[in-house]
Amino acid sequence: IFPLAFFIYVPMNEQIVIGRLDEDIILPSSFERGSEVVIHWKYQDSYKVHSYYKGSDHLESQDPRYANRTSLFYNEIQNGNASLFFRRVSLLDEGIYTCYVGTAIQVITNKVVLKVGVFLTPVMKYEKRNTNSFLICSVLSVYPRPIITWKMDNTPISENNMEETGSLDSFSINSPLNITGSNSSYECTIENSLLKQTWTGRWTMKDGLHKMQSEHVSLSCQPVNDYFSPNQDFKVTWSRMKSGTFSVLAYYLSSSQNTIINESRFSWNKELINQSDFSMNLMDLNLSDSGEYLCNISSDEYTLLTIHTVHVEPSQETASHN
């Protein structure tokens, strides 16, 4: 029979825990229950994170950065649970934590590697810069550096500009794409490999609509089934571009099923909304209604942008009066 080997120079039991910035996590550690339990959690084998012995916490020499942020599962210690509850993790908390548990008859050392990720919901924006049109995928705070990919009509695009700003603890990233004169559909994907979280932005341009003054226009906005899940909270915003900036006409929040309308001539069909169809009507068109109309359906996992260009032309009567 071969002995079961434990090399002194081989790392101990090691687990990886992935946390999200500002959220609480648990660093796991278990032992065979016994009397006279001593528990020490240390960071990078030197900073004291949490100490427990003689039936209570002893935090006199705890490193100040962990003050009021750590606790044990006190009712479960006698059952062999030495896990650490860790509040509001930051990127500075990343690293190796060692849990030393001693009892009167056994000593155990467990290592936990903590990795922290950040993924504040990205956005896809449509911007006009002079005569150029841009789609911008951006994420305000992300860590580690994400993978950003663009597709045009479902075909990957190799050119991929990234404007990156690094702060103390995360990256802020903009990825602009010049889409001037294009009526293709575009898709941008931002992936955080650590948190295994992916966000997708999709932009679709609809054919231009020509309408006469005083008529009404119906603009479609139906989410693509690939991304859309009606069970997930989302927001729908209709806006109109005037002089390079968008003004909000109306929005709908799925969580409260509230619709807020800022333009009296705008109407939404409640029945269609219940069927996840966010098409809208704009009544009594006038010449100043010409422009680009943007439907934005957004959740934590996607942004779907649909753009319509509306041309309002003078009616025959108006033309003859002039």
Epitope: F6, N13, E32, Y53, K54, A104, Q106, V107
Partner: antibody, heavy 116, light 107 residues
Framework: EVQLQQSGPELVKPGASVKISCKTS????????MHWVKQSHGKSLEWIGG????????PYNQKFKGKATLTVDKSSNTAYMELRSLTSEDSAIYYC?????????WGQGTTLTVSS | DIVMTQSHKFMSTSFGDRVSITCKAS??????VAWYQQKLGQSPKLLIS???TRHTGVPDRFTGSGSGTDYTLTISSLQAEDLALYYC?????????FGSGTKLEIK
Amino acid sequence: EVQLQQSGPELVKPGASVKISCKTSGYTFTEYTMHWVKQSHGKSLEWIGGINPNNYGAPYNQKFKGKATLTVDKSSNTAYMELRSLTSEDSAIYYCASGGYYFDYWGQGTTLTVSS
Amino acid sequence: DIVMTQSHKFMSTSFGDRVSITCKASQDVGTAVAWYQQKLGQSPKLLISWAFTRHTGVPDRFTGSGSGTDYTLTISSLQAEDLALYYCQQHYDTPFTFGSGTKLEIK
């Protein structure tokens, strides 16, 4: 009665390796951590490390990294320590000792002499 | 690593004396201190853990005390069989460390 019976004295040449055994009886082998302690001639005690027979992660002293390898054979309730790349500095008495963070029971010690 | 200092390598005493052996830790070890007795040619023997808890079978003339960084092993009335080397050990954290030892001798 708890007993920890260690293997006999060893005389080895520099650069060689040696494996010391510690056979236990009188208690449940898997419940206790088995520690190893070095006592150089006329000197104090130095803790080398421990091993948990039931696979839990075991603590060790970084000073002995690459020098000592601890193993157990649960079927015979025996713990082993192998020391490699031996030099005269490794000449000492080596004890096995069972317990948690203090050591309740000790073996009688194994004297290791490293000499050419 | 935590350093355990036993400042007296030797202590000259007489039978029946009250003897105090001291040990100082380089940092607060929260009473996680054990004391061992080692007689010539023998293995160490556990006397006390947690600074003052006597191990099974240890005579009550041996008592431990202390807190923070300063610890003491007291033998209330020295007997002939107590002549030995005494080591302190911190069991607060790994790596466990021992003092250099204090040897009791007769004057």
